[in-house]
């Protein structure tokens, strides 16, 4: 079997990066992209980024959403651009929370 583009390692994807861990970058490259939402001190904290090593995201991406945190993962260039993680509110809102994008 022959192929024109040998695969000697897993593919890396371009991901949107938003949050403290991104530094000055607006993107990162990893084996998985993610979009997360967590509640910190009453604030909705939105973050986006990538897991460079697959194992990093393995557990995180499989964790089901909880009232305090949700993570959505995907594989594909810029696949997390239009993903906004949702908390499992079942239509209810948490009193005293505000939206906050961590830059």
């Amino acid at each position: 079997m022959e192929d024109e583009k040998p695969k000697v390692n897993p593919k890396l994807y371009m991901c949107v990066c938003e949050g403290l861990s991104c530094g000055n970058e607006d993107h990162c490259e990893g084996q998985q992209c993610f979009s997360s939402l967590s509640i910190n001190d009453g604030f909705h904290v939105y973050q986006k980024g990538c897991f460079q090593v697959y194992e990093q995201g393995k557990m995180t991406c499989k964790t089901p959403p909880s009232p305090g945190q949700a993570v959505e993962c995907c594989q594909g260039d810029w696949c997390n651009r239009n993903i906004t993680a949702q908390l499992p509110t079942k239509g209810k809102s948490f009193p005293g929370t505000q939206n906050f994008h961590l830059e």
């Epitope: 000697v8 897993p10 371009m14 993107h27 084996q31 697959y54």
Partner: antibody, heavy 114, light 113 residues
Framework: QVQLVESGGGLVKPGGSLRLSCAAS????????MSWIRQAPGKGLEWISF????????YYADSVKGRFTISRDNAKNSLNLQMSSLRAEDTAVYFC???????WGQGTLVTVSS | NVVLTQTPISSPVILGQPASISCRSS???????????LSWLHQRPGQPPRLLIY???NRVSGVPDRFSGSGAGTDFTLKISRVEAEDVGVYYC??????????FGGGTKVEIK
């Protein structure tokens, strides 16, 4: 055709610094991630550093972490490796390679000795 | 970190005869995406390495079909069905499963007896 040409090797004293460069041609440089791999005289291959397409992601082997810095200039089609606090065990031929390790330069020899 | 152990260290062979090189990994090289990123490279004296085989058994375009790769999990083999003079040099296995940390085996020197 794809061409990778390393430069910057030479003799340096322990504790010294050196900057290696790799000039790339024959392909769209910004479409590929790049690696530095070294080979001590008469020894095997050791991967030492990786940089992603845009340079946003960098990785280092434990043996060089904190001492070596990889960078790239996509406008100039060049890959760089800044090496500091050099040790005798860093003596090797340093190759730059384009993913998926199908294309390698001829290498540049770095000798660390007093 | 994954450790790759190659055997034998040296393999004197007769032209036209087969040769076999083993590569054993300290842990499974099956990635979560289902692929096994085990490659083989060949390095002639004074030259950079050349990629021969990837994902265990896939030959790179232009590599003669006398080279074949096999194996799974932690045990892999490179076979040369009929050794030719140009096949001398050192063969390395390499894992990319733990990318971006790549690991090479110690190498196997193939020489003509």
């Amino acid at each position: 055709q794809v061409q990778l040409v390393e430069s910057g090797g030479g003799l340096v004293k322990p504790g010294g610094s050196l900057r290696l460069s790799c000039a790339a041609s024959g392909f769209t440089f910004s479409d590929y991630y790049m690696s530095w791999i070294r080979q001590a005289p008469g020894k095997g291959l050791e991967w030492i550093s990786f940089i992603s397409r845009t340079g946003s992601t960098k990785y280092y082997a434990d043996s060089v972490k904190g001492r070596f810095t990889i960078s790239r200039d996509n406008a100039k089609n060049s890959l760089n490796l800044q090496m500091s606090s050099l040790r005798a065990e860093d003596t090797a031929v340093y190759f730059c390679a384009r993913e998926p390790l199908q294309h390698w330069g001829q290498g540049t020899l770095v000798t660390v000795s007093s | 970190n994954v450790v790759l152990t190659q055997t034998p260290i040296s393999s004197p062979v007769i032209l036209g005869q087969p040769a076999s090189i083993s590569c054993r990994s300290s842990q499974s090289l099956v990635h979560s995406d289902g692929d096994t990123y085990l490659s083989w490279l060949h390095q002639r004296p004074g030259q950079p390495p050349r990629l021969l085989i990837y994902t265990v058994s896939n030959r790179v375009s232009g590599v003669p079909d006398r080279f074949s790769g096999s194996g799974a999990g932690t045990d892999f083999t490179l076979k040369i069905s009929r050794v030719e003079a140009e096949d001398v040099g050192v063969y390395y296995c390499m894992q990319g499963t733990q990318f971006p940390a790549l690991t090479f085996g110690g190498g196997t020197k193939v020489e003509i007896k």
